[in-house]
Structure formats: structure tokens, C-alpha cells
Amino acid sequence: AGVFELQIHSFGPGPGPGAPRSPCSARGPCRLFFRVCLKPGLSEEAAESPCALGAALSARGPVYTEQPEAPAPDLPLPNGLLQVPFRDAWPGTFSLIIETWREELGDQIGGPAWSLLARVTRRRRLAAGGPWARDIQRAGAWELRFSYRARCELPAVGTACTRLCRPRSAPSRCGPGLRPCAPLEDECEAPPVCRAGCSLEHGFCEQPGECRCLEGWTGPLCMVPASTSSCLGLRGPSSATTGCLVPGPGPCDGNPCANGGSCSETPGSFECTCPRGFYGLRCEVSGVTCADGPCFNGGLCVGGADPDSAYICHCPPGFQGSNCEKRVDRCSLQPCRNGGLCLDLGHALRCRCRAGFAGPRCEHNLDDCAGRACANGGTCVEGGGAHRCSCALGFGGRDCRERADPCAARPCAHGGRCYAHFSGLVCACAPGYMGSRCEFPVHPDGVSALPAAPPGLRPGDPQRYL
């Protein structure tokens, strides 16, 4: 078990032209808060995958009102650390997602408006117990400066917080500055190197250069029995000069409550009152619940009544994401059929349908031929949302009202001559060809006969219709 800690140092416009003057919109003042999400591994996880290692929300920052003539380079931030306790082993490789959220405080429909201002993702390797790692990340036009670390909480130790160690009053078989680990007493914790001369029997350290004393011993090197010393009664890690550990007068001594929890004594024990977002005997476990208000943009929090059950946000139409933080481009799903134009009105989708189609999604094909007559014996054909007339021979145009020349398309192949006729057209084929369109060569041994022109028609007189 342990705690991942994130310290936001600054958030403000990045360098260069085009940097925003204010995080607030034109609607008025706003304030910032942060959400940290930890995911195991270094793989490119889907944005919607859960924060399996834990998540935390910061408090709201001070209200910011833009001063147009003097934009603040760094915006007022929430105080304090963001802490994400982890129950199991620290994975070493992880994805760190830091979201900067804006809460607009002007008159908003449905309460304050929440919007994601910036999101940075870092995939890192980090050993527990190491120093603070500093980072600067850009997200669009914004710049975020932060530090982070992972630390184990006793009795867990090691780079993954998996080994359970405890100081022992028995003489140690470990080397200088090292303490034995339980349950394997012969295994020794990896060093920090304690202050030179720190008693191997009565002292131990958690930080390099430190010398902490076991109960009953004191002095800068834990060589002096406490009963004969003028013990200062310091508890916890001593300063670099002196200190000792003495039996605490009460169960809340040294405040066993993590993550800002407050301790109150109960008969023979203690009770931690945990801040929002944490629970457990010592407030050591992170558990964002529905009580933390994790759903934005009018989302409804479902489940998550207790920290052991995950919450789900049911998002209003137009929003998505695990916290309803993303606006959906609903038209990207192409809901309008048959070539309809999609309009996202915010409260609803509208489809503007092409001629011949109707319905909320343009799904209904109207009867294109309703009330439409085709002249001169033409028949109406539906399709594509626009009516079309299939005209009788000799007629054309949208409604078959125009006279058409059946020979205009030169239907007779191989030099055949075309004769327009009331029942269609006739091809007079050139020698050596036959067929209704003169498309077949006559076999050499066959006889070719040129059909005579129909009575009443002269070749080359296509304009004459009977």
C-alpha cells in the first residue's frame, strides 16, 4: 500500500503568440480544479478505460476574473496535494492523466457549467520511494508544471511497496543502516544509508542520513537508553540533529490518519474522519463516489454509493466520457439517411431531408409519383427521391412532353441507315451486316438482304412520324 502524490505548481498560458488571456469564457468568472487519473502500464489505453490505480479530484481554486490589461501568467490554483492512495503493489510503469477543469460561475442552465480545459497524459516509469519528479507539459495553448512521486506507507517498503518491514528490537543481522524485513527476518530492506555511526541494534532510517531510534533508545546515534536521557519526545522521523521515539500517550499520537484525515480517540483505539474522496480505517484508500459529484454537464451518477462499488455517469444526450466531460459530435454518426443534412441543435438532432424523403431521420421515401402525370403514354418511375418518367418511344423530357428523334443516338451500327417509325425505329443495314441494329456481320457463305424501307418512309427522313 502507498500513496501517489501530485503537486500542481502552476497552470497558465503557454509561451508564444496566441496564448489565451484567461481560462474563463466571456460568460464571467470561473475557477479551476484538477482531476488526476492513474492507469497501470505504458500502453496506449483508451481514454474511457477506468482509472484502475485510482483517481482524485482537487478542491476548487479561487475565483478568477480576467483583468484584460494584465492577464495572470499563472492562474490561482487549489491548495494542497492531490493524493491517490493505492491498495496493492505500485506497478512501477503507469499512465498519469491530469485534467484541468473550468467551473463557470455565471448564470448557467442547470447550474454551473463544467468544461475540460486541458488534459495531459504522461507514461512513466517511477519507483516508489524515489524523489519528486518534476515535469512541464503543454496541452494546447496551456502549460502545466507539476511534480509527482509514489511513496509506500509503513509497514510496506520497497520500490513496489510489496515488502512488509518492521523495525525490530532484536539485534539485526542486516548490514549497517539496513533493517530486517518481516516475514523473512533474514531478508533485508534495500538501503537507505543511515547517518554514519547510527546504532545497528537500536536505530534505523527511512531516508538517507537519518537515524531514528527504537523505543527505549535516544541520542543522535540511538546509543543512549531513553531512561537516562533528556528525551525531547519527538515522534516520527527525527531531524538531522536529534530525536527519539517514545511510547505515544494516545492512539492519535502522530496522527495515523492519512490524506488529511482527522483523528479522534475512542476507548482503546482511534477513529479517522476522512476527507471527501478517501475512506478506510486510516483514510488510506481513494474512492471517488457519487457523493463527490464526478458527473459533469448534467450527468447522473449511478451506483457508487459506497467506495467499493464503481460509479457510472449516465450522460445527457450530447455528452460522453466516463464523467460526461466530452461533447459529442452527434452528426459524425451520420444519423440522417438518404443524403439528409444533419443539424446538431444542442437539445436535439435535426435532419434536413432531400426532396422526396421525410421523417426524423429522412428514413421515409415519399411517393415520388403521387400526383405526377407523364404525358404521351409515359410511365412514372420512383427512385432517388425525385420522380422520373419513362417515356414512350418518340417522346422525351421530364414529363414526356417533348418530341424525341429515335435516330438521334445513331443506333444503327456499321453504317446502317435509321428510319424513324411510329412503333420504333428500323435499321437498313449496309451490305455485309444484319441484325436489328446491324450489329452482326453476315457470314461469307450467307446471303445478305437489305430490308426495304417501310412504306411511306424515305431513307434519311427521320423527322417524319406517322
Epitope: 442547470g110 457523493a291 448534467g298 451518477c301 449516465h314 444526450p317 436535439a348 438532432l349
Partner: antibody
Framework: QVQLQESGPGLVKPSETLSLTCTVS????????WSWIRQPPGKGLEWIGY???????NYNPSLKSRVTISVDTSKNQFSLKLSSVTAADTAVYYC????????????WGQGTLVTVSS | EIVLTQSPGTLSLSPGERATLSCRAS???????LAWYQQKPGQAPRLLIY???SRATGIPDRFSGSGSGTDFTLTISRLEPEDFAVYYC?????????FGGGTKVEIK
């Protein structure tokens, strides 16, 4: 103008299943969440559950084991089924549209009284 | 679940008077996700206020909502004859959606 109309039998026998349908006009059922709320005679309002056209549902835990809400987008309708009814389920049943700005109810049907009696 | 307690149960006032209705939540309602409804006998409820203080479309400005956290108030600045009805609050912060028990505003 958005309108909702409840329909279904006004009398149901104990232990049977209450079935109601809400027909929506003036709004696409695919664009909103839709809900059922009931009100026993002379008493307050009780939320039953809601549905989204995608099939997402959420029910009141006090009724969850007996409730099914379904949607028919082709008919612009959604329905309520409440099984194993008792006299305590006698109420006016309202269908309502859930607003876009949050999970409150901006349009309601006029309600239909369902009496559970043998 | 969040339990909403409305008080008083009944408010007896005359037309022209100011009505103040209270709705108290058993847990904090995040982001002021609270709505108010008016219901007249034989009718469905009608949305008045959402987001604790935003008036719904077509609602006269004599109706106003305020409050945050666990304490919310609906105020009718000058009662009109048509305002005598039962008023309900509803939270939509988390599931299950819950209503208050109602406050009846009757003519004195």
C-alpha cells in the same frame, strides 16, 4: 409541441403484470431519455426508472426486481412492465421526458390511473 | 439515496403574499442539481425551476429558486390565485432520482 400519452389497462389483478405504453409526439424518442413516475392516490411522486433509445436503463432500487422499461423507436413509444403487482402499486402512472440539461422532467403525460384489485 | 424533506407540509397564505418553501437534502446535492415542480389537482406536475435557480421556459418571474448543498428554497414573491397547488422538489445529482414529500400551498 411535445406531447406524451399513456395508454394501458386501468385495472390489473394482484400478482399479474401491469403494462403501460407512452406514445411520444413532437419529439424524436432517439434524442432524449424517457422516464416513468408514479403517484399513489393522495401521496407524493416516486420515480420508477428511465430508458435511452440505445437501451440504457436505470431503475429505482425499490422496484428494480419487478420493473422492465423498453423502447420502440419505430413507433416513437416506450413501455413499462411491472410484475407481481399488489394493491400498493395502485397509482397514477406518468410518463415523462428527461431534459437535456440534467435528469429532471420537462414534459409529462397527463397520467393514467392503474388500480390493482381482484 | 438522497432523502429530500420539504417543509412546511402545508402553507396557508392569501393571494398577494410571499410564499417560502424549503427543501432539505440528507446529503449534499452536487452542482445544485435540484428541480422544483408545481402540481394542481388532477393534473401532471409542471417543471418550474431546475439547477436550483434557473426558471423553466414560460415560468413567470415571481417564481425563484435558491440554495446549495443541502438547503434549497422556492420563493413565490406574490401569490396569484393560480399558484395554489402542491410543490415538489427533486434531486438529479445521483441515482435513484428522488422527490420531496411536497408542500401544499392553500388559500387562507
Amino acid at each position: 409541441q411535445v406531447q406524451l400519452q399513456e395508454s394501458g389497462p386501468g385495472l390489473v389483478k394482484p400478482s399479474e403484470t401491469l403494462s403501460l405504453t407512452c406514445t411520444v409526439s413532437g419529439a424524436s424518442i432517439s434524442s432524449f431519455y424517457w422516464s416513468w413516475i408514479r403517484q399513489p392516490p393522495g401521496k407524493g411522486l416516486e420515480w420508477i426508472g428511465y430508458i435511452y433509445y440505445s437501451g440504457t436503463t436505470n431503475y429505482n432500487p425499490s422496484l428494480k426486481s419487478r420493473v422492465t422499461i423498453s423502447v420502440d423507436t419505430s413507433k416513437n413509444q416506450f413501455s413499462l412492465k411491472l410484475s407481481s403487482v399488489t394493491a400498493a402499486d395502485t397509482a397514477v402512472y406518468y410518463c415523462a421526458r428527461i431534459a437535456v440539461a440534467g435528469f429532471f422532467f420537462d414534459y409529462w403525460g397527463q397520467g393514467t390511473l392503474v388500480t390493482v384489485s381482484s | 439515496e438522497i432523502v429530500l424533506t420539504q417543509s412546511p407540509g402545508t402553507l396557508s397564505l392569501s393571494p398577494g403574499e410571499r410564499a417560502t418553501l424549503s427543501c432539505r437534502a440528507s446529503q449534499s446535492v452536487n452542482k445544485n442539481y435540484l428541480a422544483w415542480y408545481q402540481q394542481k389537482p388532477g393534473q401532471a406536475p409542471r417543471l418550474l425551476i431546475y439547477g436550483a435557480s434557473s426558471r423553466a421556459t414560460g415560468i413567470p418571474d415571481r417564481f425563484s429558486g435558491s440554495g446549495s448543498g443541502t438547503d434549497f428554497t422556492l420563493t413565490i414573491s406574490r401569490l396569484e390565485p393560480e399558484d395554489f397547488a402542491v410543490y415538489y422538489c427533486q434531486q438529479y445529482d445521483r441515482s435513484p432520482l428522488t422527490f420531496g414529500g411536497g408542500t401544499k400551498v392553500e388559500i387562507k
